[in-house]
């Protein structure tokens, strides 16, 4: 079964900078990746970036840079302008779509015990109905 993993990392040198790493584990090619914060795609989440494997990326503040790391993983750099660093308590979600085969989504956040510079362990939080688009024709 395909799976999505999410890691949230605080930069050691810049405490207001965060990076979200997401990856897709499974067969098939990815046609679109959507990154949101505050909840899953379409369920209260706010879009941060959309990445297409051939057509490029689109991003919205506070996203700073979205990029592909491999054919099945992406990273999104975020700049937290607020003094209270709300990112530390925020959920980030990544949705990998493979049209028309299916879409899969998981969420993650910075662990409370994280020291700056240490990446969160890859513990995906599956979203119920994440594979509701998994059709067979």
């Amino acid at each position: 079964t395909p799976e999505v993993w999410v890691q949230v990392q605080m930069e050691a040198t810049e405490l207001s900078s965060f990076t979200v790493h997401c990856g897709f584990l499974g067969p098939g090619s990815i046609s679109l990746v959507t990154v949101s914060w505050g909840g899953p795609d379409g369920a209260g989440g706010t879009k941060l970036a959309v990445l297409h494997p051939e057509l490029g990326t689109r991003q919205w503040a506070p996203a700073r840079q979205a990029r592909w790391e491999t054919q099945s993983s992406i990273s999104l750099a975020l700049e937290d302008s607020g003094a209270s660093s709300p990112f530390a308590n925020t959920t980030f979600c990544c949705k990998f779509a493979s049209f028309p085969e299916g879409s899969w989504e998981s969420c993650g956040s910075l662990p409370p015990s994280s020291d700056p510079g240490l990446s969160a362990p890859p513990t995906p939080v599956p979203i119920l109905r994440a594979d509701h688009h998994h059709h067979h024709h």
Partner: nanobody, 120 residues
Framework: QVQLVESGGGSVQAGGSLRLSCAAS????????MGWFRQAPGKEREGVAH???????RYVESVKGRFTISQDHAKNTLYLQMNSLKPEDSATYYC??????????????WGQGTQVTVSS
Amino acid sequence: QVQLVESGGGSVQAGGSLRLSCAASRYTSRTDCMGWFRQAPGKEREGVAHIDSDGIPRYVESVKGRFTISQDHAKNTLYLQMNSLKPEDSATYYCVVGFKFGDYCAPNDWGQGTQVTVSS
């Protein structure tokens, strides 16, 4: 995620018409295009038509003048009126909502698809 349910597919003779409908579970304001893709066995998947958030319809060259895409915001429904159908229009048609990259509507959510068969 947005639930999309297509209807209106079927079998028709060449030159005939069909009207596809797509009911969305909720308003899709967080994406910026809504449209139709099609996939025929052994052929490349293609975007048939979509409507931007500004309401402008866009069509693939092969259906211009024959297909018309429209929306009913009150019913959260997308339509595709298909006239002068040709055998090469036979395919599974998917309703999609997505994000614009230039003139392309990249699917973020889609329905299960409805089959259109045009016989000569």
